[in-house]
């Protein structure tokens, strides 16, 4: 049958040959393949300024296979499309275009955003965060003892990170100041060596803490007796209570 086609076409093309290569049923020196063997696709291959017919088992990038009764050819995808399933359904767009429902768009429709990695129009995703954890114990420098004024923290997880146009994530941790009844650190918490030195240092820190929290400008340089200290602390506590009534509570948020 193919031989018959090759023989017949010799009337139209002086150089038609039956001894074709690469899946051609009929071919010529000038045009390359004229027709293809069954199941192969005809495509024009550009070689410089010349176009040569070739027969392929599948179509090259930028083309899709069209099958008609006994005649198959590679048909170009639309001008903005790199890879397509058929004329109306693109699977990969050319540079600068975004894929949406098989079409190539230069910008994404409302309610969608461009994913510059996949070059697709995707739904806008907003941030989702979990509920807050309970507040942590009141702490200072990683300890829960040896101070009156510390900080407590609570955290939450990001359940869904936002896409480029999505709502930003809220803070994932929150810290606030807290006041507790000062309790002495046990031996294990203080360490064995230099307890006296540490006690002096602690007292100094407490003074720093209380003086700064009561808006005092200077710091006492002398070391106070336990009685003086207790008296002073009582006064500071009263001041703090009065201030706290006004201020309710101080809260600091930090994003991590």
């Amino acid at each position: 049958q193919n031989a018959s086609r090759g023989r017949r076409q010799r009337r139209m093309h002086p150089n038609v040959s039956q001894g074709c290569q690469g899946g051609c049923a009929t071919c010529s020196d000038y045009n390359g393949c004229l027709s293809c063997k069954p199941r192969l696709f005809f495509v024009l291959e550009r070689i410089g300024m010349k176009q040569i017919g070739v027969c392929l088992s599948s179509c090259p990038s930028g083309y899709y296979g069209t099958r008609y009764p006994d005649i198959n050819k590679c048909t170009k995808c639309k001008v903005d499309c790199d890879t397509c399933f058929n004329k109306n359904f693109c699977t990969k767009c050319k540079s600068g275009f975004y894929l949406h429902l098989g079409k190539c768009l230069d910008s994404c429709p409302e309610g969608l955003e461009a994913n510059n990695h996949t070059m697709e129009c995707v739904s806008i995703v907003h941030c989702e965060a979990s509920e807050w954890s309970p507040w942590s114990p009141c702490m200072k420098k990683g300890k829960t003892c040896g101070f009156k004024r510390g900080t407590e923290t609570r955290v939450r997880d990001i359940l869904q990170h936002p896409s480029a146009k999505g709502n930003l994530c809220p803070p994932t941790s929150e810290t606030r100041t807290c006041i507790v009844q000062r309790k002495k650190c046990s031996k294990g918490e203080r360490g064995k060596k230099g307890r006296e030195r540490k006690r002096k240092k602690l007292n100094k820190e407490e003074r720093k803490e209380t003086s700064s929290s009561s808006d005092s400008k200077g710091l006492e340089s002398s070391i106070e007796t336990p009685d003086q200290q207790e008296n002073k602390e009582r006064q500071q506590q009263q001041k703090r209570r009065a201030r706290d009534k006004q201020q309710k509570s101080v809260s600091v948020s930090t994003v991590h």
């Epitope: 017949r8 139209m12 093309h13 009929t26």
Partner: antibody
Framework: EVQLQESGPSLVKPSQTLSLTCSVT????????WNWIRKFPGNKFEYMGY???????YQNPSLKSRISITRDTSKNQYHLQLNSVTTEDTATYYC?????????????WGQGTLVTVSA | DIVLTQSPSSMYASLGERVTITCKAS??????LSWFQQKPGKSPKTLIY???RLVDGVPSRFSGSGSGQDYSLTISSLEYEDMGIYYC?????????FGAGTKLEIK
């Protein structure tokens, strides 16, 4: 030289079936693709369909429910049937051949036959 | 279906003149374009296929060019026998479609 010749009635009544034959000489209809094309008054051409070397057919979707293309290899002829004709089907009907995408399309045409649809 | 828009629809030209007829497709037809000529009372005659390839026996004054959606047929030096109606035809996909024709007459 390949030659194609259309034949059939020149007048058909509305709602009847238009039947034409294309007789081919100089080539076998078991090679290539054998087509029907029509030209309406006013010079507008319409592609109707083809029958391939193996006997498979393609019909223009605009005519699909009404058109049938068949062949008789022993006579080296192929046929067109168009059902339920109206005056809109008045045209000159041509048969033509091509051999593949890399060669000339409609390298050979019949001389055409005018079919008038009228009561 | 692909629409082929041919222009002009008719024209007058002098013998020896260079004539160009254009055909614009509604989408890229990848060079699968043919030109044929029809004279009154005669069957069509294919002149050019695959945009720029001359059918055997067609005078070399006929040439075709183009790509994508835009194609043209040029007659380098018009001769009397060139009068008739010229049509473009695409065969990039089925159904094939034709231009409406350009009637070429001698001045």
């Amino acid at each position: 030289e390949v030659q194609l010749q259309e034949s059939g009635p020149s007048l058909v009544k509305p709602s009847q079936t238009l039947s034409l034959t294309c007789s081919v000489t100089g080539d076998s209809i078991t090679s290539g693709y054998w087509n029907w094309i029509r030209k309406f008054p006013g010079n507008k051409f319409e592609y109707m369909g083809y029958i391939s070397y193996s006997g498979k057919t393609y019909q223009n979707p605009s005519l699909k429910s009404r058109i049938s293309i068949t062949r008789d290899t022993s006579k080296n002829q192929y046929h067109l049937q168009l059902n339920s004709v109206t005056t809109e089907d008045t045209a000159t009907y041509y048969c033509a051949t091509y051999y593949g995408y890399g060669g000339p399309w409609f390298a050979y045409w019949g001389q055409g036959t005018l079919v008038t649809v009228s009561a | 279906d692909i629409v082929l828009t041919q222009s002009p629809s008719s024209m007058y030209a002098s013998l020896g003149e260079r004539v160009t007829i254009t055909c614009k497709a509604s989408q890229d037809i990848d060079s699968y374009l043919s030109w044929f000529q029809q004279k009154p009372g005669k069957s069509p005659k294919t002149l050019i296929y695959l945009t720029n390839r001359l059918v055997d026996g067609v005078p070399s004054r006929f040439s075709g060019s183009g790509s994508g959606q835009d194609y043209s047929l040029t007659i380098s030096s018009l001769e009397y026998e060139d009068m008739g109606i010229y049509y473009c035809l695409h065969y990039d996909e089925f159904p094939l479609t034709f231009g409406a024709g350009t009637k070429l007459e001698i001045k």
